[in-house]
Interface confidence: medium
Amino acid sequence: EVEKTACPSGKKAPEIDESLIFYKKWELEACVDAALLATQMDRVNAIPFTYEQLDVLKHKLDELYPQGYPESVIQHLGYLFLKMSPEDIRKWNVTSLETLKALLEVNKGHEMSPQVATLIDRFVKGRGQLDKDTLDTLTAFYPGYLCSLSPEELSSVPPSSIWAVRPQDLDTCDPRQLDVLYPKARLAFQNMNGSEYFVKIQSFLGGAPTEDLKALSQQNVSMDLATFMKLRTDAVLPLTVAEVQKLLGPHVEGLKAEERHRPVRDWILRQRQDDLDTLGLGLQG
């Protein structure tokens, strides 16, 4: 912590500008008014203060707002956000999506830090649910965001938000997460026609039950092997050879290459050899 010293004559900062980068830490502490800093926070991001100097500026804001910063200051924190601890952020009440975007922009290109995770948690809890605009924003910055949530947290995602989800946002989701998301997706896309519906629901199918897979097999969807391999084993096992053949269409030949991997391996073992032979792929049950 910087000790309190009087500001040298003529050094009192009338505004936040680039001349301050040449101030020593004790001069920043003594000569920059905290209230002035708070009202001109938008300028700080355009000034290349060193991290040591940013520590001083943060200290001044902490003294001015011991209960947590107001959103008017938070929105303009810029690089100073990188100096905040999760404990600091837990004191904030962030309600504006613009504020969230501004702070995520600062951390752009880096993996999610504890600060960012805390910020997002505060924001989502404040909103009560993960609405479409928020999800849109979060997945744009962190494609893996959705899959970082627990099934319990995902249960608060309204079906309308599912429209914001892109296939790559689900790449790292496990079956438990897809079990929660699939019914929401099914509800969200229910009014779409067959082929359009399949395009949208495809990346969520790792959470689909057997009856839905059976229904899809009647719609000439031509599911690719990559999607098939992500289906729940327990959902695939009851499917007949004819149903799998209809589900995969021309991609059925790919089963041979995957015959040693789940769920294909387990499914093959459940089928009658006569039925498997009808595929002409040499699959051995």
Epitope: E18, A46, Y51, H110
Partner: antibody
């Protein structure tokens, strides 16, 4: 990948000026401050100053305030440094360097290829 | 201005050696120090930042340590490709300043 391309050499006469360029590629030019550094043989490196490509803001080492002028051209992602009233003391290699900061660090992560300025009549 | 000093301008070494290069700051700079390597005719390359963090792609034989005013760059198993100039730089306060550097040479 991130690159900062500088012309290799500049031969100038004493008293003249020279404008050095630093063309950035492989990243968003306006997202990072650009610094300039002087290196004379056997004398280490000296920080000249930096410019903020997003708004053209500049800061100079007091020692170089009357020597260097930093500018940027966003449209071509190029930073410039003009050196004036050149003397033999200004003969050196001049580097541009990108300044990066993240959640707990800051540093020059990429240096330009360097321009050798020779002041000679 | 903060003065950075590397008192050894040259160091003789052999392949396999453990080499320590020392850098001193004229005042406390915390951990705001970086180490760079520069080979003849080339631009400097970042090795260590924040005094002790190895930059991406830098071999783990390079380590940085220290804080406050005393900093050390250590090469644990000297290789022939490590023959170069090494310099430290502070970014605790402006103007940013560099030490004169240490040139590693073969004995």
């Amino acid at each position: 990948q991130v690159q900062l391309q500088q012309p290799g050499t500049e031969l100038v006469k004493p008293g003249a000026s020279v404008k050095l360029s630093c063309k950035a590629s492989g990243y968003t030019f306006t997202s990072y401050w650009m610094h300039w550094v002087k290196q004379r043989p056997g004398q280490g490196l000296e920080w000249i100053g930096h410019s903020n490509p997003s708004n053209g803001g500049t800061n100079y080492n007091e020692k170089f305030k009357s020597k260097a002028t930093l500018t940027v051209d966003k449209s071509s992602s190029t930073a410039y440094m003009q050196l004036s009233s050149l003397t033999s003391e200004d003969s050196a290699v001049y580097y541009c360097a990108r300044w990066v900061r993240g959640s707990n660090y800051e540093y020059f992560d990429v240096w330009g290829t360097g321009t050798t300025v020779t002041v000679s009549s | 201005d903060i003065v950075m000093t590397q008192s050894q301008k040259f160091m003789s070494t052999t392949v396999g050696d453990r080499v320590s290069i020392i850098c001193k700051a004229s005042q406390n700079v915390g951990s705001a120090v970086a180490w760079c390597q520069q080979k003849p005719g080339q631009s400097p390359k970042l090795l260590i930042y924040s005094a002790s963090n190895r930059y991406t792609g830098v071999p783990d034989r390079f380590t940085g340590s220290g804080s406050g005013t005393d900093f050390t760059l250590t090469i644990s198993n000297m290789q022939s490709e490590d023959l170069a100039d090494y310099f430290c730089q502070q970014y605790s306060s402006y103007p940013l300043t560099f030490a004169g550097g240490t040139k590693l040479e073969i004995k």
